[in-house]
Interface confidence: low
């Protein structure tokens, strides 16, 4: 969250790959985990604008992909998130950090692989149930963050093919016992619970039986509540803007927060020729703040109508909750009407802070 002015050239940047860093970090995550990649500036100096790339394609921020200048977070990772990730300088495309990420199918979460562990004809005439993949059943205690998907598996066989049923804390467990229900995939000997909550904690037992016998396995599930954090602001928003005198401008700010956020739009101003007050903090005016009739959606947009040269300057989206505060800033450049076309043609929109 740099407070400095970011010079940003929007348009085609020359693809000049820099030297590949000597070391490529190999990282392994479980399905459903949050992938976190950190890329501090080399030598601790300023890094400038950066872009995160996966398998050669720029990553687009979303509710699941949180992109910051020095950090990338991919929430609820799946197999598709495996690949080569790099953080590059936006203008030069020089690679600053490189990671090889593999997302494995942790036994605690993730989607089923189609057809895997299906009931198989073992060729045995008759027989009591037995575990076909005991090595996949080693992890008896599962601790997962709330909102993740959990899957318990008890792959088994027998002749005749055994049935499978599930107990929670020793009692029959059915879909109506939890909000969001459960998925019982008998062909894959699995129980799937999506978006787990603290009330899903407990002991889950699979009971596999046929007329020759019965086997069972108990798993213990602990649901970790999400640790609260200050609001997360979507990278790249608000974006720098260049506008013609008299036109309308919109700044956007996307806020993610577990706790109720308090959003404000600020404009940096000068008082008696100074940009900062006696406490060393910038002078600002509050342009938009939460009111009795304002929704969070409305607060995520700042609209400026019929802009004048006085509207030019730095604008800040500020979001706070009970944990702390986050802010992103952007600049508005206001051009005289007749200069606008020339500026756009020659520079592909140049934003100078």
């Amino acid at each position: 969250e740099s407070l400095g002015t970011e010079q940003r050239v929007v348009g085609r940047a020359a693809e000049v790959p820099g030297p590949e860093p000597g070391q490529q970090e190999q990282l392994v995550f479980g399905s459903g985990d949050a992938v976190e990649l950190s890329c501090p500036p080399p030598g601790g100096g300023p890094m400038g604008p950066t872009v995160w790339v996966k398998d050669g394609t720029g990553l687009v921020p979303s509710e699941r992909v949180l992109v910051g200048p020095q950090r990338l977070q991919v929430l609820n990772a799946s197999h598709e998130d495996s690949g080569a990730y790099s953080c590059r300088q936006r203008l030069t495309q020089r690679v600053l950090c490189h990671f090889s990420v593999r997302v494995t199918d942790a036994p605690s979460s993730g989607d089923d692989e189609d057809g895997e562990d299906e009931a198989e004809d073992t060729g045995v005439d008759t027989g009591a149930p037995y575990w076909t993949r005991p090595e996949r059943m080693d992890k008896k205690l599962l601790a997962v963050p709330a909102a993740n998907t959990v899957r318990f598996r008890c792959p088994a066989a027998g002749n005749p093919t055994p049935s499978i049923s599930w107990l929670k804390n020793g009692r029959e467990f059915r879909g109506e016992h939890r909000i969001g229900g459960i998925k019982l995939r008998h062909q894959q000997w699995s129980l799937v619970m999506e978006s787990v909550v603290p009330s899903d904690r407990g002991n889950y037992t699979c009971v596999v039986e046929n007329k020759f016998g019965s086997i069972r396995q108990t798993y213990t599930l602990d649901v970790l509540e999400r640790s609260p954090h200050r609001p997360i602001l979507q990278a790249g928003l608000p974006a720098n803007q260049t506008a013609v005198l008299g036109s309308d401008v919109e700044f956007h700010c996307k806020v993610y927060s577990d706790a109720q956020p308090h959003i404000q739009w600020l404009k940096h101003v000068e008082v008696n020729g100074s940009k900062v007050g006696p406490d060393g903090t910038p002078y600002v005016t509050v342009l938009k703040t939460a009111g009795a009739n304002t929704t969070d959606k409305e607060l995520e947009v700042l609209s400026l109508h019929n802009v004048t040269f006085e509207d030019a300057g730095e604008y800040t989206c500020l979001a706070g909750n009970s944990i702390g505060f986050s802010h992103h800033s952007a600049w508005l450049v206001v051009l005289p009407a007749e200069e606008e076309l020339v500026e756009a043609d020659e520079a592909g929109s140049v934003y100078a802070g």
């Epitope: 006696p278 800040t316 500020l318 706070g320 009970s322 702390g324 505060f325």
Partner: antibody
Framework: QVQLVQSGAEVKKPGASVKVSCKAS????????MHWVRQAPGQGLEWMGW????????NYAQKFQGRVTMTRDTSISTAYMELSSLRSEDTAVYYC???????????????????WGQGTLVTVSS | DIALTQPASVSGSPGQSITISCTGT?????????VSWYQQHPGKAPKLMIY???NRPSGVSNRFSGSKSGNTASLTISGLQAEDEADYYC??????????FGGGTKLTVL
């Protein structure tokens, strides 16, 4: 839960110095500004200054400039306030108070003291 | 040293409403919407009751409300209860002194 635990009461002679500690727990110590506020017997609250535990940066009220020093030890999540050249009018309860301002956050006009220490009574008497 | 002026004391009967005023200048209360109110029981640390003029932290009763007009901020307590008896302090950002408190108001519930 957030807790600020201060050191015990002190009795000092005029001209001496006192150093009060404030141990934080239940949150990331380096993420929030720590302020010091004092209250003389039967009087109101008086703001003394803040320290940014992340950077060690400080800002003192004009009245205390030159006499107060605020420091921190991040390894034990503890903030300290040292007041020198004590006089009888410095007799007061000294509070540390966490403000909701993140140390990543520059917009310090909006200062909310959401958690307070229990207070340390400093008596200055000859 | 006291930059913000509060009445030394106010009183009211249970169930009544009372208002405590906090008067400053255009460089503090009047210039910014950053007025907070704290409640302090004898021998205890202060507790945040109102911030940003009129916002209540979670856990604070909705009997407490704040407002501002010009250079004066006000704290109103409705449906007065015995446990409301305490000292109340206003606090504001001040463009010269940074953080200033009022002198405090002793609330007595009759």
């Amino acid at each position: 839960q957030v807790q600020l635990v201060q050191s015990g009461a002190e009795v000092k002679k005029p001209g001496a110095s006192v150093k009060v500690s404030c141990k934080a727990s239940g949150y990331t110590f380096t993420s929030y500004y720590m302020h010091w506020v004092r209250q003389a017997p039967g009087q109101g609250l008086e703001w003394m200054g803040w320290i940014n535990p992340n950077s060690g940066g400080t800002n003192y009220a004009q009245k205390f400039q030159g006499r107060v020093t605020m420091t921190r030890d991040t390894s034990i999540s503890t903030a300290y306030m040292e007041l020198s050249s004590l006089r009888s009018e410095d007799t007061a309860v000294y509070y540390c108070a966490r403000s909701m301002n993140s140390t990543m956050y520059w917009y310090l006009r909006r200062v909310l003291f959401d958690h307070w220490g229990q207070g340390t009574l400093v008596t200055v008497s000859s | 040293d006291i930059a913000l002026t509060q009445p030394a004391s106010v009183s009211g009967s249970p169930g009544q409403s009372i208002t405590i005023s906090c008067t400053g200048t255009s460089s503090d209360v009047g210039g910014y919407n950053y007025v907070s109110w704290y409640q302090q029981h004898p021998g205890k640390a202060p507790k945040l009751m109102i911030y940003d003029v009129s916002n209540r932290p979670s856990g604070v009763s909705n009997r407490f409300s704040g407002s501002k007009s010009g250079n004066t901020a006000s704290l109103t307590i409705s449906g007065l209860q015995a446990e409301d008896e305490a000292d109340y302090y206003c606090q504001s950002y001040d463009m010269y002194n940074y953080i200033v408190f009022g002198g405090g108001t002793k609330l007595t519930v009759l």
